[in-house]
């Protein structure tokens, strides 16, 4: 279930925008980055898609938001929330957050000025 996140811009607008896009390619891209091509992460068939392709698909999805710049933090928070339970330890959580904060730059978007990724009731 989606919980209410701290909003940077127009809250209802950002929520609708994040709801409308498919964040799976971003989740897959970041998992690929932190786990490489390890076979242990078999919940997604990530070996068949090159990392750069996955990154472009992720950027493509983020670009579908009406205002990606304004709602980027909400998108990053949702990705974090979606993947939180899959992150096995604290080190993996930190790696995931690091990669997540690099995502806007990888996609040539401006990074949000402030974005708190401590979502999911402290689990992550």
């Amino acid at each position: 279930m989606r919980r209410e996140r701290g909003r940077q811009g127009d809250s209802s607008s950002c929520e609708r925008q994040v709801d409308r896009v498919n964040l799976k390619p971003c989740e897959q891209h970041i998992m690929q980055r932190i786990m490489g091509e390890q076979e242990q992460y078999d919940s997604y068939d990530i070996r068949s898609t090159r990392s750069s392709d996955q990154q472009q698909r992720c950027c493509d999805e983020l670009n579908e938001m009406e205002n990606t710049q304004r709602c980027m933090c909400e998108a990053l928070q949702q990705i974090m929330e979606n993947q939180c339970d899959r992150l096995q330890d604290r080190q993996m959580v930190q790696q995931f957050k690091r990669e997540l904060m690099n995502l806007p730059q990888q996609c040539n978007f401006r990074a949000p000025q402030r974005c708190d990724l401590d979502v999911s009731g402290g689990r992550c």
Epitope: G9, D10, S12, S13, C14, R16, R20, Q56, R57, C59, D60, E61, N63, E64, E66, N67, T68, Q69, C107, N108, F109, R110
Partner: antibody, heavy 119, light 112 residues
């Protein structure tokens, strides 16, 4: 120079087909989402179709669904609009335009190509 | 009929201030979507005049400004000049339409 150049317009009979091309230069097309916008003579702008950078999102104006098909070939730096079952009301200048990265507006436009549907 | 409503024409004398309105609904401007404005001279392609409700691209004079409130937006031009005579279009994003792109019908600005 960063530019878009449309081609493929011309005179076609009602019921006929036409394929418009949009050649991009000066920027990386594969990272850009693109749209076609048309303008009937003496009328306003009407959005026609949209294709995202990886082609995973394709949209059409409701009035055109089923008759027009947008596609792209990033290796050829081109975007296309295949138009079929053309009608007189499809007459106008067709513009190719680039969606800006991170926001929902068109920051680069071609000069347009004229499509005339007449018997 | 356009999803966004603009007056078909406005006019003003050189040096005057004119405004062009753009009225939408709760599924586009009223839903928080940004409004963008394009200028089009006869025989030319449109180009962005204002983006993100009130941002001017480099090269656009500060005589052009825009604002947004509720379900509508407006473009203001101060110190009107002869070469401002053109068509002006607003554009936004609509959550209820599959394509999302929506334009206003356009406003012809005549400098008297």
């Amino acid at each position: 120079e960063v530019q878009l150049v449309e081609s493929g317009g011309g005179l076609v009979k009602p019921g006929g087909s036409l394929r418009l091309s949009c050649a991009a230069s000066g920027f990386i097309l594969s990272r850009s989402s693109m749209s076609w916008v048309r303008q009937a003579p003496g009328k306003g702008l009407e959005w026609v179709s949209y294709i995202s950078s990886t082609s995973s999102h394709i949209y059409y104006a409701d009035s055109l669904k089923g008759r027009f098909t947008i596609s792209r070939d990033n290796t050829e730096n081109s975007v296309y609009l295949q138009m079929s079952s053309l009608r007189a009301e499809d007459t106008g200048v067709y513009y190719c335009a680039r969606k800006t990265n991170g926001a929902w507006f068109l920051d680069l436009w071609g000069r347009g190509t004229l499509v005339t549907v007449s018997s | 009929q356009s999803v966004l409503t603009q007056p078909p024409s406005v006019s003003g004398a050189p040096g005057q201030r004119v405004t062009i309105s753009c009225t939408g609904s709760s599924s586009n401007i009223g839903a928080g979507s940004d409004v963008h404005w394009y200028q089009q001279f006869p025989g030319s392609a449109p180009h962005v005049l204002i983006y993100g409700n009130n941002q001017r691209p480099s090269g656009v004079p500060d005589r052009f400004s825009a604002s947004k409130s509720g379900t509508s937006a407006s473009l203001a031009i101060t110190g009107l000049q002869a070469d401002d005579e053109a068509d002006y279009y607003c554009q936004s994003y609509d959550y209820d339409l599959s394509g999302s792109w929506v334009f206003g019908g356009g406003t012809k600005l005549t400098v008297l």
